[in-house]
């Protein structure tokens, strides 16, 4: 039975050219996290963290994505095209798969604020 809950940073905004932290947190389960996948709205993978071997950043994002903090992901040099949904997928044993959603809005405005609150989707 899957008892866990994914908490995410929810809906966030950040400035064009800036950076943003995409963060998910799995709670309420003792399941072992074997892998975390980060993917974009078009289902293209940005990065994967394997519990045994570490982070693999996909070549297309190598210059703009940094692993961490923790199991999160830092997206840098933001463009307007980065606006959209991002998904974290936690592969766990024995529970199975948990999935969280974050919506990122990249703003032209210099007063854009990056909210860092956690929420349960």
């Amino acid at each position: 039975m899957m008892t866990g809950t994914i908490e995410t940073t929810g809906n966030i905004s950040a400035k064009k050219g800036g950076s943003v932290i995409l963060q998910c947190h799995l709670s309420s389960t003792m399941a072992q996290v074997t892998q975390v996948n980060w993917e974009q709205h078009d289902h293209s993978l940005l990065a994967i963290r394997n519990a045994e071997l570490g982070w693999h950043i996909y070549p297309a994002f190598k210059d703009r994505v940094a692993p961490g903090p923790g199991l999160g992901l830092t997206l840098q040099s933001l463009t307007m095209n980065d606006t959209g949904e991002y998904f974290c997928t936690y592969h766990t044993y024995p529970d199975g798969t948990y999935r969280g959603r974050i919506f990122l809005e990249v703003l032209e405005s210099s007063v854009a604020e990056h909210s860092a609150r956690f929420q349960i989707p």
Epitope: I48, E52, L53, G54, I57, P67
Partner: antibody, heavy 128, light 108 residues
Amino acid sequence: EVQLVESGGGLVQPGGSLRLSCAASGFTFTDYYMDWVRQAPGKGLEWVGRTRNKVNSYYTEYAASVKGRFTISRDDSKNSLYLQMNSLKTEDTAVYYCARGQYYYGSDRRGYYYMDVWGQGTTVTVSS
Amino acid sequence: EIVLTQSPGTLSLSPGERATLSCRASQSVSSSYLAWYQQKPGQAPRLLIYGASSRATGIPDRFSGSGSGTDFTLTISRLEPEDFAVYYCQQAVPSPLTFGGGTKVEIK
């Protein structure tokens, strides 16, 4: 041409120390995991340990047989990998190879790890 | 740690014959983390197969790999003189990375 060249092997007494080097060329060293593998005379291959790449903060991991005695490090500015061996034992006598570790996820979303480039090896003899 | 057991220890065959090498894991491993290497006397190992079945660059198609779970196989369809060597399987996940004990393919 992608190439790995080991050096630093030699004869050392039990309890002594030795530092092996591996010079890499022909590829972007900072992007790759690097492994050390050894082979005792007439025996099979034994994994010694590895250092991960820059993205993974150069995290190191070791085989139980060498943990606490051997230290793996790298200098990306020199495209070089090192193996510092302390408290050497006779059973550490072997040919030591450095190898490039290929760790990635394919379009099939499956993870892969293998060693696709190997050096020629350097011989370490521990004997009194 | 996962123990990889290769069999047979030695395989005596003639050029042109088919070689079938086995690698058995003490517990299930992901096929994508299973590789095969060839080693000739006085030389470094050379990658043959990765992901259990994908041939490395420059490896002839007479070499093929298969298997999943705990049982993996390296097949050489028609042995060439240069194929007589020692073959090792290797797994990377779960840690630590381990090698099989090797199978020597010798000329009969």
